[in-house]
């Protein structure tokens, strides 16, 4: 149809920096590159209706729906969403095309639905339909990658059964120890599913999607390395694939490798060998032991032997269900104000855990480090010497674990006072929890040495602020002390702090703080 305008519908994804509700706008904010939504004429519809490709948006994401109209003359427009009309302000771009935009900021469930744009031009009227839905992240999964041998090739395929489909990458390192940290120059990343170079020192495969990143390391016994003090242990769940690589380097090719499970040679089809020359013409041999789907009877000691190296073993344990083993008893610590200190949890878990440290309803990232003995450790040092309750939470597909810590900071009491017509109260958060004394200041006792024992009520730790204990002491008013200055003092092993209060004075109570070490 010659009369129909040329229209283009685009989606613009924004970096979030606003929290307004959806609004029609002629000048959207700075954004990512636009994505063409097609906008095809809808067949068998009354009138001219264009339909844009369906738009899926993450919760809290900000987007702009935009229509570019290449038609002569002016245009007027109207947005309709859930039977409500929304203001529409077209403008013209440098190519003199009409531009109509709908900005949706911080996408929520209520903003999902059909957006109808009615456009009236000098020549014709037409409607554009956008369907916006929230991406269902509940269906998203990120599974730890696993290995398979490539059919008829000496290569490993890395597989992660995740939704949306993850990006798979191999992370390779030929160095030893610390230099194989993720961002080290010794680390090489290959964004592909198949790996042919299987001789490296450290081989990991990682899968990442919107939910994060999960990695699996190729379990390796290196016969040229000094064995760990404790036997390396590999856990697997029934049905998972087993891959162990045995690696050995020798001055020449006159050596061979063999795998045994509990002193019996592995069956053919459960291992394969590769060899290549390394630096100084030394020979590297690697021997893989693999089981495509493990059963309980695959548990045991796998030993790699060489005719030119001492044998080394690994204990493979097949479990029905994942686990997290750690002591969950709560732990209390008291430290000085400037003492360096980290909380730490030592655990053994399979599959690998996801974890968080929480303090004062705020979560902190959790790092885990593998130890030589098969255990892992997570440390938290970022407490900034704030006393209170810290929580370590860990979970994997099959298990959950929570451990509580209390941190007390040894310090001299700090006293706060308040008074009413009938009583005066003092509060302190020092640690160890302070003891209290009340003193009356009078002509007979200008230095406030006359102790008050009547009408004093001490409450220790009556208020728990994120695990931080507060101690208070209250003095009930009596005729004997009305109109006098009184002094409350909190003291512990680190010092004393006092506050002076004028009882029964009109208006706001003057408090005089008095620090005594």
């Amino acid at each position: 149809n010659q009369d129909l305008p040329v229209i283009k519908c685009v989606l613009i994804n924004h970096k979030n920096n606003d929290s307004s509700v959806g609004k029609s706008s002629s000048y959207p904010m700075v954004s990512e590159s636009p994505e063409d939504l097609g906008c095809a004429l809808r067949p068998q519809s009354s009138g001219t209706v264009y339909e844009a490709a369906a738009v899926e948006v993450d919760v809290s994401a900000s987007i702009t729906l935009q229509v570019l109209v290449d038609a002569p003359g002016n245009i007027s427009c109207l947005w309709v969403f859930k039977h409500s009309s929304l203001n529409c302000q077209p403008h013209f771009d440098l190519q003199n095309r009409g531009v109509v935009s709908m900005v949706i900021l911080k996408m929520t469930e209520t903003q999902a639905g059909e957006y109808l744009l009615f456009i009236q031009s000098e020549a014709t009227n037409y409607t554009i339909l956008f369907t916006v839905s929230i991406r269902n992240t509940l269906l998203y999964t990120l599974r730890r990658p696993y290995f398979r041998k490539m059919e008829n090739q000496d290569a490993l395929v890395c597989i992660s059964e995740s939704v949306p489909e993850p990006i798979v990458e191999w992370v390779l390192c030929d160095s030893q120890g610390e230099s194989c940290k993720e961002e080290s120059p010794a680390v090489v990343k290959k964004e592909e599913k198949v790996l042919h170079e299987l001789f490296g020192t450290d081989i990991r495969c990682c899968a990442r999607n919107e939910l994060g990143r999960e990695c699996t390391r190729l379990f390796t016994i290196d016969l040229n390395q000094t064995p760990q003090t404790t036997l390396p242990q590999l856990f697997l769940k029934v049905g998972e694939p087993l891959w162990i690589r045995c690696k050995a380097v020798h001055v020449n090719h006159g050596f061979g490798l063999t795998w045994e499970l509990e002193n019996k040679a592995l069956e053919e089809g459960n291992y394969f060998e590769m060899s290549t020359y390394s630096t100084n013409r030394t020979m590297i041999r690697i021997l893989f032991a693999f089981v495509s789907s493990v059963a309980r009877n695959d548990t045991g000691y796998y030993t790699c032997s060489s005719s030119k190296h001492p044998s080394q073993s690994a204990l493979v344990t097949i479990v029905e269900k994942g686990f997290i083993n750690a002591t969950n008893s709560s732990e209390d610590y008291e430290i000085d104000q400037y003492e360096e200190f980290c909380f730490s949890v030592r655990f053994k878990a399979y599959p690998q855990i996801r974890c968080t440290w929480t303090f004062s309803r705020k979560s902190f990232p959790c790092e885990q480090k593998g130890l030589d003995n098969g255990y892992s450790i997570s440390k938290f040092c970022n407490h900034k010497h704030q006393p209170g309750e810290y929580i370590f939470h860990a979970e994997n597909d099959d298990a959950q674990f929570t451990k509580m810590f209390t941190l007390n900071i040894r310090r001299k009491p700090q006293v706060l006072a308040e008074a009413s017509a009938s009583q005066a109260s003092c509060f302190s958060d020092g640690y160890p929890l302070p003891s209290w004394t009340w003193k009356k200041c009078s002509d007979k006792s200008p230095n406030c040495t006359e102790e008050i024992t009547e009408g004093v009520w001490n409450r220790k730790a009556n208020r728990k602020v994120f695990g931080q204990w507060v101690s208070s002491s209250t003095l009930n008013m009596s005729e004997a002390i009305k109109g006098f200055l009184v002094k409350c003092c909190a003291y512990n092993s680190l010092g004393t702090s006092c506050e002076t209060i004028l009882l029964n004075s009109p208006g706001p109570f003057p408090f005089i703080q008095d620090n005594i070490s």
Partner: antibody, heavy 119, light 113 residues
């Protein structure tokens, strides 16, 4: 001592297949790769492919892809090379040769098997 | 594929004289990671399989007489027989094993003058 012993000479008709064997002895069969190389009468050496006897994995030269199949039997320490759809230009001596790595020199060679393709 | 080109195609040298065969690869066969040239030389006598003489471009295989030597790096290589003996009459092949497919030179026929 280390040796590779190949099967005897074969005469085949065009379109037929031939399967040549190479039996290894004197070393650990699965610890070395095996290559197949052919040599037409009065011509040079032509690499056909490689097999890892440990895994059975193979890589073939593009020219022979789809016509050649290399297999192994670890119980008898033997590798096999089967060439199908034979034509007269496949008349050659076929050698198996051992190497330490996939990319290494060929240190031990079989004695060769003469395959004649003739109608 | 890496193309290997030998020169000359044939060579006649007097007994006791030096024989030199050249081999050129279409791309470098020097592997930077281990600084090795992935090049070998083979000797083939009539009715026999080839025999490995030199690997890593310059390392003599055990049992090979020391009159055979290899040199060169990258793309240009040489096999030298310092003093030709009657039993050295054969066809000599260079081979790259830097990458698959493995490729051979066309061969150089060495005869006695």
């Amino acid at each position: 001592q280390v040796q590779l012993v190949q099967s005897g000479a074969e005469v085949k008709k065009p379109g037929a297949s031939v399967k040549v064997s190479c039996k290894a002895s004197g070393y650990t069969f699965t610890s070395y790769y095996m290559h197949w190389v052919r040599q037409a009468p009065g011509q040079g050496l032509e690499w056909m492919g490689i097999i890892n006897p440990s895994s059975g994995s193979t890589t073939y030269a593009q020219k022979f892809q789809g016509r050649v199949t290399m297999t192994r039997d670890t119980s008898t320490s033997t590798v096999y090379m089967e060439l199908s759809s034979l034509r007269s230009e496949d008349t050659a001596v076929y050698y198996c040769a051992r190497s330490v790595g996939a990319t290494s020199a060929f240190d031990i060679w079989g004695q060769g098997t003469m395959v004649t393709v003739s109608s | 594929d890496i193309v290997m080109t030998q020169s000359p195609d044939s060579l006649a040298v007097s007994l006791g004289e030096r024989a030199t065969i050249n081999c050129k690869s279409s791309q470098s066969v020097l592997y930077s990671s281990n600084n090795e040239n992935y090049l070998a030389w083979y000797q083939q006598k009539p009715g026999q399989p080839p025999k490995l003489l030199i690997y890593w471009a310059s390392t003599r295989e055990s049992g090979v007489p020391d009159r055979f030597s290899g040199s060169g790096s990258g793309t240009d290589f040489t096999l030298t027989i310092s003093s030709l003996q009657a039993e050295d009459v054969a066809v000599y092949y260079c081979q790259q094993y830097y990458s698959l497919p493995v490729t051979f030179g066309q061969g150089t026929k060495l005869e006695i003058k």
